[in-house]
């Protein structure tokens, strides 16, 4: 299922570099959210719980992210030219049932107020 | 088509040890949680332990805590259950199950485990 | 821990009858809208297989025949019309907190 643009401030700038917002519903409770830059994985986490309720948290890919109980945030630093391209949260919901795919993005522009080290 | 497959079971003394393993087949192994289940012959269910993904996360009933261990090889798609210190009590079939999320929704047709002398 | 007690220990009910298996917890296995309470029917010789998640969800494949119903601390799983495959033993479990626990089982058969 592809939901297309998001319906709210996907990326936040700040100190050279972007905060990037992937949303989920509150009633999510175990999921895989993975950042995709065009078609390429650049972090993803996951969320899920054992059979006795405990909560495991796992990055395949290595990313400054942050979780909230209805987001994750994915943080890209030192920002140039090449950051801009479309940015997507892929979210796979694994609980609760059905499962169930959403896919939201954005496109990331990148001007030279934003970028990390100007040249002078 | 998921199949967990266990072996290592048998017959050890008192106090023996033994290692239990669980191949798993037919779905991303690293992507679930995975349990040990007891049954004692003619009696009920039991959980005996679970490890999250990589292994990070360990669980142990109290029965069995500091006698029994878990682990997961996942390039190998397989779990284990490395059982020290065993008991007349311990005697069971183990079963391998793995936890779909929100249940058990996959489990293997166990391993038979007698402690006696 | 969290104590599963179920009632009645076994039953016999004629085929085309109804069955009804009850399961209480120590505590309330409520949370964030959900009961964390599951089901399986185990057979003689086989592992146990998922019927029921979420106290009333059925699992993939399972016939309609069976339900599950209740909130809180009481659960109850319906046979609506008990067929000869339907002989078995059957567990409610909770995965509300760690460790998980089963109930001792409900034996059902043919009167």
């Known amino acids: 299922e592809i939901n297309g643009s998001a319906n709210y401030e996907m990326f936040i700038f700040h100190n050279g570099g972007v905060q990037i917002l992937c949303k989920y519903p509150d009633i999510v409770q175990q999921f895989k959210m993975q950042l995709l830059k065009g078609g390429q994985i650049l972090c993803d986490l996951t969320k899920t719980k054992g059979s006795g309720n405990t909560v495991s948290i796992k990055s395949l890919k290595f990313c400054h992210s942050q979780l909230s109980n209805n987001s994750v945030s994915f943080f890209l630093y030192n920002l140039d030219h090449s950051h801009a391209n479309y940015y997507f949260c892929n979210l796979s919901i694994f609980d609760p049932p059905p499962f169930k795919v959403t896919l939201t993005g954005g496109y990331l522009h990148i001007y030279e107020s934003q970028l990390c080290c100007q040249l002078k | 088509e998921v199949q967990l497959v266990e072996s290592g079971g048998g017959l050890v003394q008192p106090g023996g040890s033994l290692r239990l393993s669980c191949a798993a087949s037919g779905f991303t192994f690293s992507d679930y949680w995975m349990d040990w289940v007891r049954q004692a012959p003619g009696k009920g269910l039991v959980w005996v332990s679970n490890i999250d993904h990589d292994g990070n996360i360990i669980n142990f009933a109290p029965s069995v805590k500091g006698r029994f261990t878990i682990s997961r090889d996942n390039a190998k798609n397989t779990l284990y259950l490395q059982m020290n210190s065993l008991r007349a009590e311990d005697t069971a079939v183990y079963y391998c199950?793995?936890?779909?999320?929100?249940?058990?929704?996959?489990w293997g047709q166990g391993t038979l485990v007698t402690v006696s002398s | 821990d969290i104590v599963m007690t179920q009632s009645p220990d076994s039953l016999a009910v004629s085929l085309g009858e109804r069955a009804t298996i009850n399961c209480k917890s120590s505590?309330?296995?409520?949370?964030?809208?959900?009961?964390?309470l599951i089901w399986y029917q185990q057979k003689p010789g086989q592992p146990p297989k998922l019927l029921i998640f979420?106290?009333?969800t059925r699992h993939t494949g399972v016939p309609d025949r069976f339900s599950g119903s209740g909130s809180g601390t009481d659960f109850t799983l319906t046979i609506s019309s008990l067929q000869a495959e339907d002989v078995a033993v059957y567990y409610c479990q909770h995965h509300y907190s760690s460790p998980p626990t089963f109930g001792p089982g409900t034996k059902v058969d043919i009167k």
């Open positions: 199950a793995r936890w779909g999320h929100y249940a058990f929704d996959s």
């Open positions: 505590q309330s296995l409520l949370s964030s809208g959900y009961n964390y």
């Open positions: 979420y106290a009333s």
